[in-house]
């Protein structure tokens, strides 16, 4: 009596159970009463990641440099390519289908968290006593110079964008 269900890693065809092709291989011809399933390895830039009866392998993902992408991990006959962003860029989605340039923090703001391949720069306003005079994706807010420790006095107050200006103390005449 012909089977109605097959074991794991098998499939039912023409009333008989045939072996599935292993990951990394595609189906060329189904088994018969006298022959085994015929499978063939996937070619260059192709993969299949499961036991299968596919007649065509899937194409590896292309990491398009025009979208800021590069290969992080080459695909194999059993795995897809993994893309990541070039340095200075980060993915726009979890699937990392394209990248955008890391945001820079404007003067008056410092970097709270440096961007990664998957997250953008996080900026924070420089609090009183700190400043940032550059637009940067790396620079934190810097503390104002302490004039007192240099035996100087503040000649011009600092802001969130500028450092204090120190000067000599007035001499007593």
């Amino acid at each position: 009596e012909p089977p109605t269900a097959c074991r794991e890693k098998q499939y039912l065809i023409n009333s008989q159970c045939c072996s599935l092709c292993q990951p990394g291989q595609k189906l060329v011809s189904d088994c018969t009463e006298f022959t085994e399933t015929e499978c063939l390895p996937c070619g260059e830039s192709e993969f299949l990641d499961t036991w299968n009866r596919e007649t065509h392998c899937h194409q590896h993902k292309y990491c398009d440099p025009n979208l800021g992408l590069r290969v992080q991990q080459k695909g194999t006959s059993e795995t897809d390519t993994i893309c990541t962003c070039e340095e200075g860029w980060h993915c726009t989605s979890e699937a990392c289908e394209s990248c955008v340039l890391h945001r820079s923090c404007s003067p008056g703001f410092g970097v709270k968290q440096i961007a990664t391949g998957v997250s953008d720069t996080i900026c924070e306003p420089c609090p009183v006593g700190f400043f940032s005079n550059v637009s940067s994706a790396f620079e934190k807010c810097h503390p104002w110079t302490s004039c007192e420790t240099k035996d100087l006095v503040v000649q011009q107050a600092g802001t969130n964008k500028t450092d204090v200006v120190c000067g000599p103390q007035d001499r007593l005449r």
Epitope: R70, V71, K74, E86
Partner: antibody, heavy 119, light 109 residues
């Protein structure tokens, strides 16, 4: 399509040197490039690769002392610092098979330029 | 660290004969292996990529095979022009893994 390396010469230990690879008939905006060296009587040694985006990757031993950069639409430079006698070799530039990957095979090579590090 | 071991270092065979060169990777590199031929005083020339894909203009006497960690280059019907040093190269991933084998000198008698 051709590649030509230049800039190889005698340099003293501790010195620096920049080699230039000039390409003809090759579009550096669509081709990755690499540098490979070969010591006298020795085998081939990968130095690093530059992708079309100008992103670079280096062999672990080359990190910090070797820098690859695209200097024009037809030239790629290899800057070498803190040179030692072990860096004496013929330096080849070569076209990589991929434009978005650091790890490539090379399907077109220049003739090479000789760098000798000696006091 | 990743290593690519090529054997033998040197091999000799007569015209019309066959030589086999082996390349062993210390970890799986799928099929990301290339073979080059280098004649004295010349740059290397690509023969084979992705284990078995012949480069343009390379005769079918050159045959690459293998996958994972074990690879072979077979040259059949040897000609005098095949006298050269042959290198394998992994181009998988990791800063160490884009390395070349030590080379095999083929001497044709």
């Amino acid at each position: 399509q051709s590649l030509e390396e230049s800039g190889g010469r005698l340099v003293t230990p501790g010195g620096s040197l920049t080699l230039t690879c000039t390409v003809s008939g090759i579009d550096l905006s669509t081709n990755g490039m690499g540098w490979v060296r070969q010591g006298p009587g020795k085998g081939l040694e990968w130095i690093g690769t530059i992708r079309v985006t100008a992103g670079t990757d280096y062999a672990n031993w080359a990190k910090g002392r070797f820098t690859i950069s695209k200097t024009s639409s037809t030239t790629v430079d290899l800057k070498m610092t803190s040179l030692t006698t072990e860096d004496t070799a013929t330096y080849f530039c070569a076209r990589g098979h991929a434009n978005n990957d650091a790890y490539v095979y090379f399907n077109l090579w220049g003739q090479g330029t000789l760098v000798t590090v000696s006091s | 660290a990743f290593e690519l071991t090529q054997t033998p270092a040197s091999v000799e065979a007569g015209v019309g004969g066959t030589v086999t060169i082996k390349c062993q990777a210390s970890q799986s590199i799928d099929r990301y292996l290339a073979w080059y031929q280098q004649k004295s005083g010349q740059p290397p020339k690509l023969l084979i990529s992705y284990t078995s894909k012949l480069a343009s203009g390379v005769p079918s006497r050159f045959k690459g095979s293998g996958s994972g960690t074990e690879f072979t280059l077979t040259i059949s019907d040897l000609e005098c022009a095949d006298a050269a040093t042959y290198y394998c190269q992994s181009y998988f991933t990791s800063d160490d893994a884009n390395s070349f084998g030590g080379g095999t000198e083929v001497v044709v008698k």
